[in-house]
Amino acid sequence: VLPRWRQQWSGSGTTSRFPETVLARCVKYTEVHPEMRHVDCQSVWDAFKGAFISKYPCNITEEDYQPLVKLGTQTVPCNKTLLWSRIKDLAHQFTQVQRDMFTLEDMLLGYLADDLTWCGEFNTFEINYQSCPDWRKDCSNNPVSVFWKTVSRRFAETACGVVHVMLNGSRSKIFDKNSTFGSVEVHNLQPEKVQALEAWVIHGGREDSRDLCQDPTIKELESIISKRNIRFFCKNIYRPDKFLQCVKNPEDSSCLSGI
């Protein structure tokens, strides 16, 4: 029997053991987070699968993921949302220490999908482990991109109080309008619930003493946020290593000086 023809995409295929990984992550998450113990992980997997299985992987919509979002609904306390752009590792290191602050990947749905790739095929119940659409080379409405757009929008919509965002000061565009933060999250913060956005610009070089809060892209971010009737603040984090150390040990004498 000849193998059935399969669409070839430019991106890497579904992560090995994807269903098992999602299910295992869900079980682990619900064991560690008492407020999510009620979650039925099999139902979560069924809804996740339902979003992309049997569907053409370049025609996925936000609507497809809403049943999953419904099952994974979680609230973050006001003032405790941390967004990030192009500096995921430091943001996650921070919330691992500062346990009362949360990135999207600290929430159930973000945790389930973090660093995974997935896609299906039109009219079959198979998962495609060979290749998946690449955002640039194939299409933007692919299962992974639409998932992150959907959950990021929801995460921003539900944020309240003072929202923080960690930005990478080493990049040419510290604030990038085309990033998930710039294209989705910024525009879905709700002015009636969010008083302010505070940007933390993370410096790369040890000797970098520039005020990156004056960067043109940060001014652009300030303008976008201010037009949405949300106040904007910006802080330079000159020494990210020291910053993390001081989050761990705020009593340390060296933490009384600037970071």
Epitope: H38, S43, A47, G50, E63, Q66, P67, V69, T73, T150
Partner: antibody
Framework: EVQLLESGGDLVQPGGSLRLSCGAS????????MSWVRQAPGKGLEWVAD????????WYADSVKGRFTISRDNSENTLYLQMNSLRAEDTAVYYC????????????WGQGTTVTVSS | QSVLTQAPSASGTPGQRVTISCSGS??????VSWYQQLPGTAPKLLIY???ERPSGVPDRFSASKSGTSASLAISGLQSEDEADYYC??????????FGGGTKLTVL
């Protein structure tokens, strides 16, 4: 033939209780989310409650939260709505409906059962 | 008060094309479905997943969605199309919500 059949509607006094049932046939009941939808006399449709396929998740309209409980018995292919602390404004025809792939639409409806709350 | 807004009534003559609209912010990111309720009967699904027709629904019924609005079009209007028409979607809390309904009269 795919079918839903409601029962249990009755005349009940304010503050009273009632349990509605909906028997399903012709499809794999345990694979589908199910809903209760009601329609007051001369009014439009109002969503009441949802239950997930395995029964582990339930959702309610604000107007019935804390008073109504949706449940299901997949072994019996039956959906239930337990209605407590009934009010005059709960008077309506109650329909059970099968959800098509979660959020596509409600593709199968029962014929409805009438609940009248009056003293 | 429904978060999906429909005109209370619409009318047309036999053979005409009639459009019924539905609007609400939650439509943007959620599927829209449409239901027909003939007098004294249970609702019937006409359109699911924004524009798709279940088998058995005539192709005279079509639908579309754009942004925060959706519409149902009935072409070649017939007397048996006289009914109440409801749009439905999930709301911002991801629970079902119905429009207030549009009563269609065939003149």
């Amino acid at each position: 033939e795919v079918q839903l059949l409601e029962s249990g509607g009755d005349l009940v006094q304010p503050g009273g209780s009632l349990r509605l049932s909906c028997g399903a046939s012709g499809f794999t009941f345990s694979d589908h989310y199910m809903s209760w939808v009601r329609q007051a006399p001369g009014k439009g449709l109002e969503w009441v409650a949802d239950i997930s396929a395995r029964g582990s998740n339930t959702w309610y309209a604000d107007s019935v939260k804390g008073r109504f409980t949706i449940s299901r018995d997949n072994s019996e292919n039956t959906l239930y709505l337990q209605m407590n602390s009934l009010r005059a404004e709960d008077t309506a025809v109650y329909y059970c409906a099968k959800n098509w792939n979660y959020n596509y639409g409600m593709d199968v409806w029962g014929q409805g059962t009438t609940v009248t709350v009056s003293s | 008060q429904s978060v999906l807004t429909q005109a209370p009534s619409a009318s047309g003559t036999p053979g005409q094309r009639v459009t019924i609209s539905c609007s609400g912010s939650s439509i943007q990111n959620n599927y829209v479905s449409w239901y027909q309720q003939l007098p004294g009967t249970a609702p019937k699904l006409l359109i699911y997943r924004n524009f798709e027709r279940p088998s058995g629904v005539p192709d005279r019924f079509s639908a579309s969605k754009s942004g925060t609005s959706a519409s149902l079009a009935i072409s070649g209007l017939q007397s048996e199309d006289e009914a109440d028409y409801y749009c439905a979607s999930w709301d911002d809390s991801l629970n079902w919500v119905f429009g207030g309904g549009t009563k269609l009269t065939v003149l």
